[in-house]
């Protein structure tokens, strides 16, 4: 977890002077508690958005938006500390909101914004604010949470995101997978521009069953210049397992930016249709 | 323009099932999670449940939880909601929702909701 562009964060608008700091999470009206709080934030909304960097690259950044509740407790609130939590990492990056001058009420209902946290492609996300100070011990809590998702690197929109680029989501192999005879795949995939090597795993299944019957690896040497964006022709050949007729193949390729962490494409053929009574085979042949 | 627009509703017996459908025009369908919120007479919004882009995860509000399904087919541009083993409760006026923006609002208090279908009638009653 990180934040984009680090500078330049504003939280400053008309009526309220602020600073944007950075937050170890912990806030010291935990340990110091006030007998006067703020009450929670109200609607808070979480999008996906896109930034870029100053050098020009292209990130997906959590776009988190709230207002204030139009009661007294405004007149307590010192700011916000704002939380993300990264859910199968429980890593956590927080900022604070610092008010430098007291919120009066006015006309329109005060509202919030920040898009600087930096989110990763198919990874979900814990957003919270909390509204500080933070309650006393016992007391209603003032901050809201949302859980929120972004999308994988298969998404159009996240595709050209610099991650997603970096793992080589730009790449269509456009994988084919015909059954030959004599237990064998013949599989056939576009190369990507890049001298790199790529891997073929195969995986058969049992029809129905998840627990493989037969894997197999073939290494594919890096393609000359001018083979980039050919196809690539592989025959394998498979184990003669009866019902070991499910078979997955996966393409992983090595590029630069990525190595052995690039994003994988998979083409899986399924077990031929059995018919459902089949014909009795007579014993004899009548011959007439 | 967006729209949504569902069908599928109507009266049914406690037990019995009935699906569900919006058809989408107006937005790449196929980049926003959707999402059921319901309406029950009297009552103020709750949501039902959520899909993100490919179906790759689904959610369910506790009280629907193993009863109802939701389901997308991205080629038809249409959202489904498979309601099985009805009860009483779940009368309400059904609405297909488009999520406001690119990602997946996970947990059950989602609202980030940008258009709304004008919503199916349920009544389960014997």
């Known amino acids: 977890l990180r934040l984009l562009d680090h500078r330049a964060l504003v939280c400053s608008q008309p009526g309220l002077n602020c600073t944007v700091k950075n937050s170890t999470c912990l806030d010291d009206s935990w340990i110091h508690p006030r007998n006067l709080t703020p009450s929670s934030p109200k609607d808070l909304q979480i999008q996906l958005h896109f930034a870029h960097t100053q050098q020009g690259d292209l990130f997906p950044v959590a776009h988190i938006e709230w207002t204030l509740q139009t009661d007294a407790s405004i007149l307590y609130l010192e700011g916000a500390e704002l939380s993300v939590l990264q859910l199968n990492t429980n890593e956590r990056l927080c900022v604070r909101f610092e008010f430098l001058s007291k919120l009066r009420h006015h006309h329109r209902r005060w509202r919030f914004t920040f898009s600087h946290f930096v989110v990763d492609p198919d990874q979900e996300y814990e957003v919270t604010v909390h509204h500080l100070p933070k309650p006393i011990p016992d007391g209603d809590p003032n901050h809201q949470s949302k859980n929120f998702l972004v999308p994988d690197c298969e998404h159009a929109r996240m595709k050209v995101t610099t991650p997603c680029m970096s793992s080589g989501s730009l790449w269509d192999p456009n994988i084919t997978v015909e059954t030959l005879e004599a237990h064998q795949l013949r599989v056939s995939f576009t190369l990507w521009n890049e001298s790199t090597h790529y891997q073929i795993l195969l995986t058969s299944f049992p029809h129905m069953e998840n627990h493989s019957c037969f894997e197999h690896m073939h290494h594919i040497p890096a393609p000359r210049p001018e083979e980039f964006h050919q196809r690539s022709n592989v025959t394998l050949t498979l184990r003669n397992l009866k019902g070991c007729c499910r078979h997955q193949v996966q393409i992983q390729p090595f590029f630069s930016s990525c190595l052995n962490d690039c994003l994988r494409h998979s083409a899986t053929v399924s077990c031929p249709e059995m018919p459902d009574t089949p014909e009795p085979i007579p014993d004899y042949m009548p011959l007439w | 323009r967006v729209q949504l627009v569902e069908s599928g509703g109507g009266l049914v017996q406690p037990g019995r099932s009935l699906r569900l459908s919006c058809a989408a025009s107006?937005?790449?369908?196929?980049?926003?999670?959707m999402h059921w919120v319901r309406q029950a007479p009297g009552k103020g919004l709750e949501w039902v449940s959520g899909?993100?882009?490919?179906?790759?995860?689904?959610g369910y509000a506790d009280s629907v939880k193993g009863r109802f399904t939701i389901s997308r087919d991205n080629a038809k541009k249409c959202l489904y909601l498979q309601m099985n083993s009805l009860r009483a409760e779940d009368t309400a006026l059904y609405y297909c929702?488009?999520?406001?923006?690119?990602?997946?609002?996970?947990?059950?208090?989602?609202?980030?909701?940008?258009?709304w279908g004008q919503g199916t009638l349920v009544t389960v009653s014997s």
């Open positions: 929702a488009k999520e406001s923006s690119l990602g997946y609002c996970s947990g059950g208090s989602c609202s980030n909701f940008d258009y």
């Open positions: 107006g937005f790449t369908f196929d980049d926003y999670a």
């Open positions: 899909i993100s882009w490919n179906s790759g995860r689904k």
